[in-house]
């Protein structure tokens, strides 16, 4: 089970919202907190270790997932072309 904790939110830039979130999860052995279908979930620890973020299935159904350069995060591209970027820190 997981819960989202929002750390802060920056809406100062028009048409762009930057939010810092983390998830608290109780995961079984070999799993770790991650994101599946845009919600916090327990995922295979190997995915985090290898930074193959798209293997978490972090985007909604119908969206395309792509890794950012240096595997620093991922983008979810909606069918209409809108892109949501998530960076991992």
């Amino acid at each position: 089970t997981c819960e989202i904790v929002t750390l802060d939110r920056d809406s100062s830039q028009p048409r762009r919202t930057i939010a810092r979130q983390t998830a608290r999860c109780a995961c079984r052995k070999g799993q770790i907190a991650g994101t599946t279908r845009a919600r916090p979930a327990c995922v295979d620890a190997r995915i985090i270790k290898t930074k193959q973020w798209c293997d978490m299935l972090p985007c909604l159904e119908g969206e395309g997932c792509d890794l950012l350069i240096n595997r620093s995060g991922w983008t979810c591209t909606q069918p209409g072309g809108r892109i949501k970027t998530t960076t991992v820190s």
Partner: antibody, heavy 120, light 107 residues
Framework: QVQLQESGPGLVKPSETLSLTCTVS????????WSWIRQPPGKGLEWIGY???????NYNPSLKSRVTISVDTSKNQFSLNLKSVTAVDTAVYYC??????????????WGQGTTVTVSS | DIQMTQSPSSLSASVGDRITISCRAS??????LNWYQQTPGKAPRLLIY???TLQSGVPSRFSGGGSGTDFSLTITSLQPEDFATYYC?????????FGQGTKLDIK
């Protein structure tokens, strides 16, 4: 509506490699995990393995030394290779989509299955 | 590996009956359990995931319950199309394992 179709030879000789392909239509292969399952005649279901969008895999340890699952996102296909087959590998082979329902991973779309017989 | 054991292995019932199939895991899997239905010559069909959530399109006469190591699938008021083989499957570990199946036939 997502549909899966298995294809490949129905007859394989002992010691050879069984090769099957699953073609995904009506949806993107990169949005899910994908799986192979088999069912020997008159018996139950056996999970063979998963493949992730990146091409990473999880295999059943009982088959790990002989099995390879790969993905071709450009063709919306994923494949199964099982080497050094014997008669015990005779089965109906199914491909399936693995859907993450929240935290619960379940195979919610299946191909119709293809029968593979291992015989000389 | 986690072992999944179903009981009974076979079951005879009549249209309109209520039946329950049990599935036991060799170690705790929380609610990471799925149920499938398979009719002869067809691919399995997902009925229930997460131990108790009905898959879209599945009739409400099907229900699932349990957590930890003990689970059940109940069908109330059996219909002719329900006579099939049912499998439980855990989704908590690798390898994913299925129960051996329960064959439900007409009495």
């Amino acid at each position: 509506q997502v549909q899966l179709q298995e294809s490949g030879p129905g007859l394989v000789k002992p010691s050879e490699t069984l090769s099957l392909t699953c073609t995904v239509s009506g949806g993107s292969i990169s949005s899910y995990y994908w799986s192979w399952i088999r069912q020997p005649p008159g018996k139950g279901l056996e999970w063979i393995g998963y493949i992730y969008p990146s091409g990473s895999t999880n295999y059943n340890p009982s088959l790990k030394s002989r099995v390879t699952i790969s993905v071709d996102t450009s063709k919306n296909q994923f494949s199964l290779n099982l080497k050094s087959v014997t008669a015990v590998d005779t089965a109906v082979y199914y491909c399936a989509r693995v859907n993450p329902f929240g935290y619960y991973y379940a195979m919610d779309v299946w191909g119709q299955g293809t029968t593979v017989t291992v015989s000389s | 590996d986690i072992q999944m054991t179903q009981s009974p292995s076979s079951l005879s019932a009549s249209v309109g009956d209520r039946i329950t199939i049990s599935c036991r895991a060799s170690q705790s899997i929380s609610t990471s359990l799925n149920w499938y239905q398979q009719t002869p010559g067809k691919a399995p069909r997902l009925l229930i995931y997460g131990a108790s959530t009905l898959q879209s399109g599945v009739p409400s006469r099907f229900s699932g319950g349990g957590s930890g190591t003990d689970f059940s699938l109940t069908i109330t008021s059996l219909q002719p199309e329900d006579f099939a083989t049912y499998y439980c499957q855990e989704s908590a570990s690798i390898p994913r394992t299925f129960g051996q199946g329960t064959k439900l036939d007409i009495k």
